[in-house]
C-alpha cells in the first residue's frame, strides 16, 4: 500500500529547486528567493545559509544548493562545513580565552592556529640539540655526543622530529 501510494504521490515528481505546494493542489512551485531544495519531492524549501560577520560567501546559494561560507582573512574554519570561524594568531603564539598569547619557554607553534607544543627531547633518542628551539620552531636534533668523539663522522643528518604530541612534558 505504501509503495502504491508513493507511486501516486504527485510530490515525488517535483525536482530539486522546487517544492510540492500544498496550497496549490500539490503542484511543483519554484523555491522562493533565498531558499533551496537539494533533492526532489520536498514539501518545503530550506532557508539559505547567510555568510555574515566573520563569514564570507565561498559559494552563492542557488535554488538547488545551499550557500557555502569560509572565514575572512585572519580567521580559519572550524567544524563541518565551516560552521565556526576561529581567529588566527602569529607563529609562536596560541589562542586562549584571553586572546593570542606567546608560547611558554620550552614550547613552540609553527602555525597560525593550534596550540603550543613541547620541544622535542633529543636526549630520549640519544641525540644532542643541534639547533635550539624557539617559540616558532622545534629544536633540531643532531648526532649523539658519542658520535662527535674524535675519529667519528662529524655530521649526520638530523633525525626527523618526533610527533610533537608524543613529546615529554
Amino acid at each position: 500500500f505504501e509503495r502504491t501510494r508513493s507511486l501516486q504521490d504527485p510530490c515525488s515528481n517535483c525536482p530539486a529547486g522546487t517544492f510540492c505546494d500544498n496550497n496549490r493542489n500539490q503542484i511543483c512551485s519554484p523555491c522562493p528567493p533565498n531558499s533551496f531544495s537539494s533533492a526532489g519531492g520536498q514539501r518545503t524549501c530550506d532557508i539559505c545559509r547567510q555568510c555574515k560577520g566573520v563569514f564570507r560567501t565561498r559559494k552563492e546559494c542557488s535554488s538547488t544548493s545551499n550557500a557555502e561560507c569560509d572565514c575572512t582573512p585572519g580567521f580559519h574554519c572550524l567544524g563541518a562545513g565551516c560552521s565556526m570561524c576561529e581567529q588566527d594568531c602569529k607563529q609562536g603564539q596560541e589562542l586562549t580565552k584571553k586572546g593570542c598569547k606567546d608560547c611558554c619557554f620550552g614550547t613552540f607553534n609553527d602555525q597560525k592556529r593550534g596550540i603550543c607544543r613541547p620541544w622535542t627531547n633529543c636526549s630520549l633518542d640519544g641525540k644532542s640539540v643541534l639547533v635550539n628551539g624557539t617559540k616558532e620552531r622545534d629544536v633540531v636534533c643532531g648526532p649523539s655526543p658519542a658520535d662527535l668523539s674524535p675519529g667519528a663522522s662529524s655530521v649526520t643528518p638530523p633525525a626527523p622530529a618526533r610527533e610533537p604530541g608524543h613529546s615529554p612534558q
Epitope: L78, M84, K97
Partner: nanobody, 123 residues
Framework: EVQLVESGGGLVKPGGSLRLSCGAS????????MFWFRQAPGEGLEWVAN????????YYVDSVEGRFTISRDNAKNSLYLQMNSLRAEDTAIYYC????????????????WGQGTTVTVSS
Amino acid sequence: EVQLVESGGGLVKPGGSLRLSCGASGFTFSSYWMFWFRQAPGEGLEWVANINQDGSEKYYVDSVEGRFTISRDNAKNSLYLQMNSLRAEDTAIYYCARGGDGYSDSHYGTDVWGQGTTVTVSS
C-alpha cells in the same frame, strides 16, 4: 531563527562614551560565551572582548583594557559593551558574536554574528 542584532553606535567626540547593545534571539543565550569584535576602516577584524555564560569571566584586548567593559543580562538575552574614554582609533564597525558549541574546551570559534553597528570617534 538564531539572530544577533547590535545597536547603540554613533558619532562621539574623543574622550566620550557609548554603550553598545546586542540583542539575542532564537537560542538559549545563557548557555554561550559571547564576544565583541571590531573592524576599523581598511583593517581586518579584531577581537575586543569576551564573556562567559554567567558573566564571571571577562577578557579584553590590551588596547581597550580599563576603558571598555563587557557585560550581559541573561534575563534580557542581551550583551553590552560600555566604551569610555573613546579614542579616534576606536572608530570601527562593532560586531557581537556567539561562541560556538564546545567553546573553551577544544576551540575558540564563533558561529553566529550580528550585522554590526558603526562607532565613529571624531572631533
